[in-house]
Interface confidence: low
């Protein structure tokens, strides 16, 4: 449905408030270093222009594509060359190359200061003084730090952010009301960002087919009563939405997401019995709710899969006629029967099935060749089951912090070239799988754990891609999307690593550690642990545990001392000497 003016079309569809918010997100995700005020100015100029196009779609430049309009606007930033260096070269290109160029320069780990939360009274005053600017600033700060954040979902977060301040700034105890809500939004926001980053990586690095396979598996688990044709339609629409958002087409993405939510709710009888409550909510909540909806119950009378996919004499004929459709049907049928499997496991099974058919349908006796294909699935299913069982036992034995430490040691030994902050961040997140998933019954553990690990390992992959330092990481990240976790699990200690020289400065601590939150103190200790392993990769668990126990005792002792700084200086020297002796450094 071609419109004379795309910008007018989107402005009318989305409304002024959402239009402005989405343009701000888009600009902040592209130019991550630009000051807030500059972005607001650009957004206001684009909005005024859009209004002229709504009034007259034939007005000058209104027929230009959104990429052309937005790219032209971004390229007016005076300090582009000084602030962004070679990104300024994008402006010499024509569309669509210019937009591709901007996309390639998105930075997953921008050099931006940590967001420090002001005092509650300061935040409430700022909120009351200028609510609109306060909320825009939230969008801007999140978008520039998370350049792939799912834009329509960020609007939902902003709505909840506004609601939290509206309620809590009037409360008797503002802090008690507000801080838990902000913590929840922060944690959910980080998780949402990481999940979307995996979707974009899937599309950008492995292509549309890989994303569609993921979507078929996930939607079939979620909507097992829906027909294959219905699931296929939803997959096609969902792929379009995420392709647009990952490509920076945020207005189209938000518009199409709203259309998809509308379609799902209008057709919920043929999709899922679990959608009723979601579909009664306003748009942003509705879309979020649908995305998170629990799996529907499986139909009671599903026949055995073997009949259609192994025993039938038409397997090779059906496969040859339409390979992707037949494999899609296999994946749909398998996934709707197995909500207890992770999506990545289902995709591994489908890949094994595809490989077997490719080989067997060219053989003298195809049926004889593929008759035992389902037997090949057994080890693929047992591998994540066993891994999750072992790690949940370890988690229950150690608790989250020590479980994270075990993973820190494990991953530092596997890929010691990776930077210490990245190893700490990734291992901490890997360790959270315990509290997130091990509490679930067996039937829910694998989809929770392995699909979460896929999200976390993708963080490692995108951070590593910026500055590649380990061919082992590159190999696990690029060879197969669905085998990333097994690839990392299979890595042993890197015997080729040249240990870092012992540097006492790395293990010198000061009294400021005493004023840190428990989480920040943990990160300090975990940073030291990674550095220890980098110095002494062959250190045993027992040696490392002894040093870390001494370190914890040292921090506790000095934080209780009257002269903390002197304690840290003197006891710190002793600790370093003892650690060197314990580790043979």
């Amino acid at each position: 449905d071609a419109h004379k003016s795309e910008v007018a079309h989107r402005f009318k569809d989305l409304g002024e408030e959402n239009f402005k918010a989405l343009v701000l997100i888009a600009f902040a995700q592209y130019l991550q270093q630009c000051p807030f005020e500059d972005h607001v100015k650009l957004v206001n100029e684009v909005t005024e222009f859009a209004k002229t196009c709504v009034a007259d779609e034939s007005a000058e430049n209104c027929d230009k594509s959104l990429h052309t309009l937005f790219g032209d606007k971004l390229c007016t930033v005076a300090t582009l060359r000084e602030t962004y260096g070679e990104m300024a070269d994008c402006c010499a290109k024509q569309e669509p190359e210019r937009n591709e160029c901007f996309l390639q320069h998105k930075d997953d780990n921008p050099n931006l200061p940590r967001l420090v939360r002001p005092e509650v009274d300061v935040m409430c005053t700022a909120f009351h003084d200028n609510e609109e600017t306060f909320l825009k600033k939230y969008l801007y700060e999140i978008a520039r730090r998370h350049p792939y954040f799912y834009a329509p979902e960020l609007l939902f977060f902003a709505k909840r952010y506004k609601a939290a301040f509206t309620e809590c700034c009037q409360a008797a105890d503002k802090a008690a009301c507000l801080l838990p809500k902000l913590d929840e939004l922060r944690d959910e926001g980080k998780a949402s960002s990481a999940k979307q980053r995996l979707k974009c990586a899937s599309l950008q690095k492995f292509g549309e087919r890989a994303f569609k396979a993921w979507a078929v598996a996930r939607l079939s688990q979620r909507f097992p009563k829906a027909e294959f044709a219905e699931v296929s339609k939803l997959v096609t629409d969902l792929t379009k939405v995420h392709t647009e958002c990952c490509h920076g087409d945020l207005l189209e993405c938000a518009d199409d997401r709203a259309d998809l939510a509308k379609y799902i709710c209008e057709n919920q009888d043929s999709i899922s019995s679990k959608l009723k409550e979601c579909c009664e909510k306003p748009l942003l909540e509705k879309s979020h709710c649908i995305a998170e909806v629990e799996n529907d119950e499986m139909p009671a009378d599903l026949p055995s899969l073997a009949a259609d996919f192994v025993e039938s004499k038409d397997v090779c004929k059906n496969y040859a006629e339409a390979k992707d459709v037949f494999l899609g049907m296999f994946l749909y049928e398998y996934a709707r029967r197995h909500p207890d499997y992770s999506v990545v496991l289902l995709l591994r099974l489908a890949k094994t099935y595809e490989t077997t058919l490719e080989k067997c349908c060219a053989a003298a006796d195809p049926h004889e060749c593929y008759a035992k294909v389902f037997d090949e699935f057994k080890p693929l299913v047992e591998e994540p089951q066993n891994l999750i069982k072992q790690n949940c036992e370890l988690f229950e034995q150690l608790g989250e912090y020590k479980f994270q430490n075990a993973l820190l040691v494990r991953y530092t030994k596997k890929v010691p070239q990776v930077s210490t902050p990245t190893l700490v961040e990734v291992s901490r997140n890997l360790g959270k799988v315990g509290s997130k998933c091990c509490k679930h019954p067996e039937a829910k553990r694998m989809p929770c754990a392995e699909d979460y690990l896929s999200v976390v390992l993708n963080q490692l992959c995108v951070l590593h891609e910026k500055t590649p330092v380990s061919d082992r990481v590159t190999k696990c990240c690029t060879e197969s999307l669905v085998n990333r976790r097994p690839c990392f699990s299979a890595l042993e200690v890197d015997e080729t690593y040249v240990p870092k020289e012992f540097n006492a400065e790395t293990f010198t601590f000061h009294a400021d550690i005493c004023t840190l939150s428990e989480k920040e103190r943990q990160i300090k200790k975990q940073t030291a642990l990674v550095e220890l392993v980098k110095h002494k990769p062959k250190a045993t668990k027992e040696q490392l545990k002894a040093v870390m126990d001494d370190f914890a005792a040292f921090v506790e002792k000095c934080c209780k001392a009257d002269d903390k700084e002197t304690c840290f200086a003197e006891e710190g020297k002793k600790l370093v000497a003892a650690s060197q002796a314990a580790l043979g450094l």
Partner: nanobody
Framework: EVQLLESGGGLVQPGGSLRLSCAAS????????MSWVRQAPGKGPERVSA????????IYADSVKGRFTISRDNSKNTLYLQMNSLRPEDTAVYYC??????????PGQGTLVTVSS
């Protein structure tokens, strides 16, 4: 963007010497171990030598021990390989990589070393 530009290669007689340099940019050079890797015509890549981030730890392939010396100058973001007593079997394209990798880390083309009389 990670850039690694190797230089210093050339034609040298058996027993001669060469000093290779690798100028690094686009990442914090002083934080990473570095390696020299070589690839002879028709063969796979072979790691010749590696050095820790601060220069204190080095390792060498058996075939070059006692003849080659790896070093680095973190203030200049540069990695070096001093090659003495060169042999015909040292003929290869030499490139530097980040970490222990034997795959190129940047767009550098490597530098060709030919040992021939």
């Amino acid at each position: 963007e990670v850039q690694l530009l190797e230089s210093g290669g050339g034609l040298v007689q058996p027993g001669g010497s060469l000093r290779l340099s690798c100028a690094a940019s686009g990442f914090t050079f002083g934080q990473f171990g570095m390696s020299w890797v070589r690839q002879a015509p028709g063969k796979g890549p072979e790691r010749v030598s590696a050095i820790s981030s601060d220069g204190s730890g080095t390792i060498y392939a058996d075939s070059v021990k006692g003849r080659f010396t790896i070093s680095r100058d973190n203030s200049k973001n540069t990695l070096y390989l001093q090659m003495n007593s060169l042999r015909p079997e040292d003929t290869a394209v030499y490139y530097c990589t980040i970490g222990s990798s034997t795959t190129p880390s940047g767009p550098g083309q490597g530098t060709l070393v030919t040992v021939s009389s």
